[in-house]
């Protein structure tokens, strides 16, 4: 038994010594981020294996101060993602003594409103601005120098707009050096560590990265005022290219920003001539109108390996050329405004007229190759009979490396059905508890409700589709009960409501004249039923005193009203 | 109402392939399993295959089983039959047919009829 | 495959009269599990699609008149009209489900 592995935080890492209890977890972010929880967990012991704590998160903080700043990096709060709205976050950078600060603009994105960064050349916020987004329409590529050790950066958003908001990248220089370069999305090496006069820097993108403006060689010059030669170079995703290398990655233009609108790019991806492309798409984010589409072959006139709109999901691809050509069209219409959104495919030649080994027949399903000859990219499909459903993965391919790319799944039946749920108004009277088929449900109704529907439900098998109730939940509705008719108001009396018609539920009450008492109950109610029916007989108003009595009824005392014509209500 | 529409006749050449298509109605497309029973004089009713739209799970009469293949697109409720490799006697009306152990709703019927 | 046999090929009656037609099954469609047969009665009437009469080999289906009426269990089945009217001139076919789909020749109700 043992912890589950904890959760590695957005934006930072964890290092782990053991899953098992008296192991530890560490945690720690990336540059620009700060860690909100603790720092180390350890995996205690019990029935089941727990961490001691919550695992952390990483966030960047609004504002802070950096002290003893050497090289790192400053994000607005919830970058790459979207900052939030009426922010003001201030942060103060300080060098070493003796140090002066550099500062790159990573990347600057604000909303086209009242948001505003400014940085100023001092520790406070009354320092002069050296950089302030209303007054400058575009970044300074060669960024920006302090002339002591501060740096002041502000950051204000107001309510309404929000959007990636910065990353600054900031580097501490000596006296006589020139700062630690930088290239987004690329690396360099340096002649020297510390970059004094006479240190020449050579700049390298990352894999699917063009090298764009500026030199790929700078140097730093000029002891009196050391400073670099050349403007830093910019690493792009450009739209096309021809790459010979044995393994690469293509980009969407621009990754992992999004990319342009009524783009048509065309990548030639060549081998050595005996061997095979293999292309591992990773990410595959593009809109509904854009087509990424991929030739088997140097040209758009070679066959289709696959064309894809929209997103989806890592899947991998294999020629059987040396070529592959790969376009991309996007949408004239339509911009696609997030980030990560393209396409990131990996390449790898891989060697030729090799098989995976043969797979096996599973029991209760079939198997069906993509093609005769199993060689890299054949794609496997095993199916289960019906009633059967498979195990494992379906989909089976032979990898570059000519193993398959999952274990053999196998087909176990399907042999039962969903929970049919319960019913509202109703108990349910369940056969065997996880519905296998043949199980039946049977619904009843509380009292004063009706069933509308099958009051039982059989499970059965399909022939395509898994097992399936033999019909839907019936539904148990308020019974609709038949009114009570009214009755008269007693002589020398009165009743309220005067109506013909009483819903079931209804009271009625009675009263008598002056000089008349009431004999028997003063509300009477209908009572529901088959058929409803009223409580109680109706009352008689009888004269306060016998004199006044025998004068008004002149005697008349056998004419009470027979009780069974007003009690029922089918009359 | 629950309505199974079906694409219009075809008339096709031996060896062809023909899509043929059914729109579902009036009811929740993956609610129920769709399939395919085709009519000619000699045979009779014959039932080709069936699809669960759920689970795109497909079952096919061993005797289609190669010649036929059997898809659905949820988002317009519609299956589909893909009929490969036609001959004469592959010339019948073919319905597409609602249901999971019986056959409760029936589409109108697609005449093929194969001839050079 | 389970081979469905219908009797007679065709029949002709009488309005008003009662009509009988059987199926047999290769095999028994009782399912023990869920307690039912396997078995639907479909009609045909000239130019039109089939239309289901009865399921489960005796549950009506809704709309349909009572004058029909499924019986039978195991591997014979019966199909009864019992009062036959002009609009039921068709060709009536049993259909199994047991084991994937197979339908009867059917038969085919003349009207004298």
């Known amino acids: 038994l043992s912890c589950h592995f904890p959760r590695r935080p957005a934006y930072g890492d964890v290092t782990v010594t053991s899953l098992h209890p008296g192991g530890s977890a560490r945690f720690h972010c990336a540059t620009g981020y700060q860690l909100k929880g603790a720092r180390h967990l350890t995996c205690l012991n019990a029935t089941q294996p727990f961490w001691d704590s919550k695992e952390p998160v990483c966030i960047a903080a609004c504002g802070g101060v950096i002290r003893n700043a050497t090289t790192g990096r400053i994000v607005s709060p919830g970058f790459p993602g979207n900052y939030s709205n009426n922010l003001t976050c201030h942060w103060l950078l300080e060098a070493p003594e003796g140090q002066r600060l550099h500062l790159h603009f990573e990347k600057v994105s604000l909303a086209e409103d009242d948001d505003r960064l400014i940085i100023r050349n001092g520790d406070n916020v009354e320092a002069p601005p050296v950089y302030d987004s209303y007054e400058v329409e575009y970044l300074p590529i060669e960024g920006l120098l302090s002339s002591g050790k501060h740096f002041f950066v502000e950051l204000s958003t107001d309510s309404s707009g929000a959007a990636a908001g910065m990353a600054l990248r900031y580097e501490a220089f000596q006296q006589g050096h020139c700062y630690e370069p930088f290239v987004k999305y690329g690396n360099f090496s340096s002649s020297t560590p510390t970059y004094p006069v006479g240190t020449t820097v050579e700049f390298s993108c990352d894999p699917g990265y063009t090298l764009e403006q500026g030199s790929i060689i700078i140097e730093c010059v000029d002891p009196h005022d050391p400073q670099w030669n050349e403007t830093e170079p910019a690493c792009r995703a450009v739209c096309s290219g021809e790459i010979t290398d044995s393994a690469g990655v293509v980009l969407s233009p621009n990754w992992p920003e999004p990319y342009g609108r009524g783009q048509d790019c065309i990548w030639g991806v060549h081998v050595e001539e005996d061997k095979r492309i293999m292309l591992d798409i990773r990410v595959l984010r593009i809109g509904p109108g854009d087509v990424l589409t991929f030739y088997d072959g140097d040209d758009l006139t070679a066959r289709v390996l696959g064309q894809y709109s929209g997103p989806r999901s890592h899947f991998k691809l294999f020629t059987s050329m040396a070529d592959v050509t790969i376009q991309f069209q996007s949408d004239p219409g339509t911009s696609v405004l997030g980030y990560q959104q393209g396409f990131v495919i990996h390449f790898f030649e891989v060697p030729r007229n090799d098989t995976c080994p043969e797979l096996p027949e599973i029991p209760n399903g079939w198997k069906s190759p993509s093609q005769p000859e199993l060689v890299h990219g054949t794609v496997v499909t095993y199916q289960c009979y019906p009633g059967y459903q498979v195990v494992g993965s379906s989909v089976l391919m032979c990898q570059w490396d000519l193993t398959w790319s999952e274990d053999l799944p196998s087909c176990q039946r399907v042999t039962s059905c969903h929970d049919p749920g319960d019913v509202e108004h109703s108990r349910r009277l369940i056969s065997s508890p996880k519905f296998p088929v043949g199980a039946t449900v049977q619904y009843i109704c509380d009292q004063g409700f009706v069933l509308m529907g099958s009051s039982i439900l059989t499970c059965h098998d399909r022939q395509a589709g898994s097992p399936k109730w033999s019909d839907r939940a019936p539904k148990c509705l308020l019974e609709q009960l038949k009114p009570c008719h009214g009755l008269s108001a007693p002589e020398n009396g009165a009743r309220s409501p005067e109506k013909q018609l009483h819903p079931a539920g209804a009271t009625i009450h009675f009263s008598c004249a002056p000089g008349y008492v009431l004999k028997g109950q003063a509300s009477i109610k209908c009572v529901p039923g088959h058929p409803s029916h009223w409580s109680d007989p109706p009352p008689i108003c009888r004269a306060a005193s016998l004199d006044g009595f025998y004068n008004s009824r002149s005697l008349d005392v056998a004419k009470a009203p027979a009780a069974s014509s007003t009690l029922d209500a089918a009359h | 109402q629950v309505q199974l529409q079906q694409s219009g006749a075809e008339l096709v050449r031996p060896g062809a392939s023909v899509t043929l298509s059914c729109k579902a109605s009036?009811?929740?497309?993956?609610?129920?399993?769709m399939h395919w029973v085709r009519q000619t004089p000699v045979h009779g009713l014959e039932w080709i295959g069936g699809?669960?739209?759920?689970?795109?799970?497909?079952v096919y009469n061993q005797k289609f089983k190669g010649k036929v293949t059997l898809t659905e697109d949820k988002s317009s409720s519609t299956a589909y039959m893909e009929f490969r490799s036609l001959t004469s006697e592959d010339s019948a009306v073919y319905y597409c047919t609602r249901g999971d152990w019986y056959f409760d709703v029936w589409g109108t019927g697609t005449t093929v009829t194969v001839s050079s | 495959d389970i081979v469905m046999s219908q009797s007679p090929s065709s029949q002709a009656v009488s309005v008003g009269e009662k009509v009988t037609m059987t199926c047999k099954s290769s095999?028994?469609?009782?399912?023990?599990?869920?307690?039912?047969?396997?078995l639907a009665w479909y009609q045909q009437k000239p130019g039109q699609s089939p239309k289901l009469l009865i399921y489960w080999a005796s549950t009506r289906e809704s709309g349909v008149p009572d004058r029909f009426t499924g019986s039978g269990s195991g591997a014979d089945f019966t199909l009864t009209i019992s009062s036959v009217q002009a609009e039921d001139l068709a060709v009536y076919y049993c259909?199994?489900?047991?084991?994937?789909?197979?339908f009867g020749s059917g038969t085919k109700l003349e009207i004298k």
């Open positions: 699809i669960d739209p759920e689970s795109d799970n497909t």
């Open positions: 009036g009811y929740t497309f993956t609610d129920y399993e």
């Open positions: 259909g199994q489900s047991y084991n994937l789909f197979t």
């Open positions: 095999q028994s469609l009782l399912n023990s599990r869920t307690r039912e047969n396997y």
